[in-house]
Interface confidence: low
């Protein structure tokens, strides 16, 4: 018995060939011997089967002795043994229809689970193997689960269903809703304007939801909601904003926030959350702010940084075009009785300068100038 695999919703063509290459009488029946379709001369006739409107043949092939049964918009319950009766012989074809669907939605938040469910006819024992866009293979039976979806899981998942040495392939497009970056860090000198950007890693026609930026300043004991906003069809509208600092927010995507000036009391880390309409859970992006301040008080030249710095970072004070006077893996460095000239405070990581602040030290009778 020939086995044919079909996909739910697709069209399948079951072949039936006569030895005579001419149009002769044929009938297709199901396992209950109910006539599906046949011919009367050059006319197609249909029987009382449940397939009625979805069953068809190709009249153009009859003259060549081919009498296919075409079933459109396949359903799982179409799985059956179909019998073609032609020239006093019977050809049997077993049709097995499978369906593969993603749980609830194909748009999932980063970190959520994807469950693929296989619909299969009774009595079948298929195996399923799916390949993610990043090449990860998952195997399973009736259900396949992938926990903790990542951004790289966005794209077309290709799943192969294997039954009776035959296979059928499904393609499912999955969109992982996430920010482009999980975390970012901004380095600023005191007083500079700070720009925070939160680009999304996906595009959808309509994007509606609400968001909030919570900020944990290094100096503060608890976190604070800096801004809450609504997103309606990709238009951003601020709901409420703290006055210290007074954030500005762009009205269009990508989400963009401006802090009027960097100050030590603002240095710290924030968590922007975005709750999308009809989605459980939230998108998150962490943002960090490091602020540098260089000051001269009497005979002491000091450079300090605030915010989440890694222990690898080096803070240095040097006179322009000279070797560093002081370099430490600390958040504050100083030089006593600095000589006159342009001093540089540098925050660097493995030789790469992340932040630089210049301060002019005048001869001892003058006051310092900060360019």
């Amino acid at each position: 018995k020939k086995v044919v695999l079909g996909k739910k919703g697709d069209t399948v063509e079951l072949t039936c060939t006569a030895s005579q290459k001419k149009s002769i009488q044929f009938h297709w029946k199901n396992s209950n011997q109910i006539k599906i379709l046949g011919n009367q001369g050059s006319f197609l006739t249909k029987g009382p089967s449940k397939l009625n409107d979805r069953a068809d043949s190709r009249r153009s092939l009859w003259d060549q002795g081919n009498f296919p049964l075409i079933i459109k918009n396949l359903k799982i319950e179409d799985s059956d043994t179909y019998i073609c009766e032609v020239e006093d012989q019977k050809e049997e074809v077993q049709l097995l229809v499978f369906g593969l669907t993603a749980n609830s939605d194909t748009h999932l938040l980063q970190g959520q689970s994807l469950t693929l469910t296989l619909e299969s006819p009774p009595g079948s024992s298929p195996s399923v193997q799916c390949r993610s866009p990043r090449g990860k293979n998952i195997q399973g039976g009736k259900t396949l689960s992938v926990s903790q979806l990542e951004l790289q899981d966005s794209g077309t998942w290709t799943c192969t269903v294997l039954q009776n040495q035959k296979k059928v392939e499904f393609k499912i497009d999955i969109v992982v809703l996430a920010f482009q970056k999980a975390s970012s860090i901004v380095y600023k000198k005191e007083g500079e304007q700070v720009e925070f950007s939160f680009p999304l890693a996906f595009t959808v026609e309509k994007l509606t939801g609400s968001g909030e930026l919570w900020w944990q300043a290094e100096r503060a004991s608890s976190s604070k909601s800096w801004i809450t906003f609504d997103l309606k069809n990709k238009e951003v509208s601020v709901k409420r904003v703290t006055q210290d600092p007074k954030l500005q927010m762009g009205k269009k995507l990508p989400l963009h926030l401006t802090l009027p000036q960097a100050l030590p009391q603002y240095a710290g880390s924030g968590n922007l959350t975005l709750a999308l309409e009809a989605k459980t859970g939230k998108l998150h992006q962490e943002v960090n702010l490091v602020v540098m301040r260089a000051t001269q008080l009497q005979k002491n030249l000091t450079c300090e940084v605030w915010g989440p710095t890694s222990p690898k970072l080096m803070l240095s004070l040097k006179l322009e075009n000279k070797e560093a006077k002081v370099s430490k893996r600390e958040k504050a460095v100083w030089v006593l009785n600095p000589e006159a000239g342009m001093w540089q405070c540098l925050l660097s990581d493995s030789g790469q300068v992340l932040l630089e602040s210049n301060i002019k030290v005048l001869p001892t009778w003058s006051t310092p100038v900060q360019p």
Partner: antibody, heavy 118, light 111 residues
Framework: QVQLQQSGPELVKPGASVRMSCKAS????????IHWVKQRTGQGLEWIGE????????YSNAKFKDKATLTADKSSNTAYMQLSSLTSEDSAVYFC???????????WGQGTLVTVSA | DIVLTQSPASLAVSLGQRATISCKAG??????????MNWYQQKPGQPPKLLIY???NLESGIPARFSGSGSGTDFTLNIHPVEEEDAATYYC?????????FGAGTKLELK
């Protein structure tokens, strides 16, 4: 259509507490903030605070910080406000409200009258 | 807190005439090109009804005889022509900064 249905009037003794409810319907409860507003008889309006039903985050007017506790139950689409240590000053009508598309309160509950009397 | 001072406290206007209510904020309520001032109408035994949001936007379903204007700290609600059903108390409210605050109200009566 959007509706905010508030619980009935309350007569309470000084020093006691009262909990009133505001049941939302006609929209996705977690998508909008619920605000609470106080109005004493013949007086103006005072903003008490707001609750984000999705997260449970509540923000109160400093004046009501020790007076009002705002909560929300996502499963029943209901916001609650509890007033404690009641005095005659707390006798008022309390409204819950929700923003529309703009920044104003486009939707209001019918109000809950609280009378504090010995 | 941002104090909103409404004037007059009450006014009487003839049918078909113009009613003008003023609201002064203790500090600017402008942000990113918008003025965060709203106006409400309240009748006895009813909750307030939103008329105008963001200084000049007419809430849906509100007749065009109501209009709002102003920016920064000075705002105005105009009703023209006044109709019998407009007798009520009118409040301004800022949604710029917590705590949100309301004006003391202006009672509009018909002559």
């Amino acid at each position: 259509q959007v509706q905010l249905q508030q619980s009935g009037p309350e007569l309470v003794k000084p020093g006691a507490s009262v909990r009133m409810s505001c049941k939302a319907s006609g929209y996705t409860f977690t998508d909008y903030v619920i605000h609470w507003v106080k109005q004493r008889t013949g007086q103006g309006l005072e903003w008490i605070g707001e609750i984000y039903p999705g997260s449970g985050s509540a923000y109160s007017n400093a004046k009501f910080k020790d007076k009002a506790t705002l909560t929300a139950d996502k499963s029943s689409n209901t916001a609650y406000m509890q007033l404690s240590s009641l005095t005659s000053e707390d006798s008022a009508v309390y409204f819950c409200a929700r923003r529309g598309n703009g920044t104003g309160f486009a939707y209001w509950g019918q109000g809950t009258l609280v009378t504090v009397s010995a | 807190d941002i104090v909103l001072t409404q004037s007059p406290a009450s006014l009487a206007v003839s049918l078909g005439q113009r009613a003008t209510i003023s609201c002064k904020a203790g500090q600017s309520v402008d942000y990113d090109g918008d003025s965060y001032m709203n106006w409400y109408q309240q009748k006895p035994g009813q909750p307030p009804k939103l008329l105008i949001y963001v200084a000049s936007n007419l809430e849906s379903g509100i007749p065009a005889r109501f209009s709002g204007s102003g920016s920064g700290t000075d705002f105005t609600l105009n009703i023209h022509p006044v109709e019998e059903e407009d007798a009520a108390t009118y409040y301004c409210q800022q949604s710029y900064k917590d705590p949100l605050t309301f004006g003391a109200g202006t009672k509009l009566e018909l002559k």
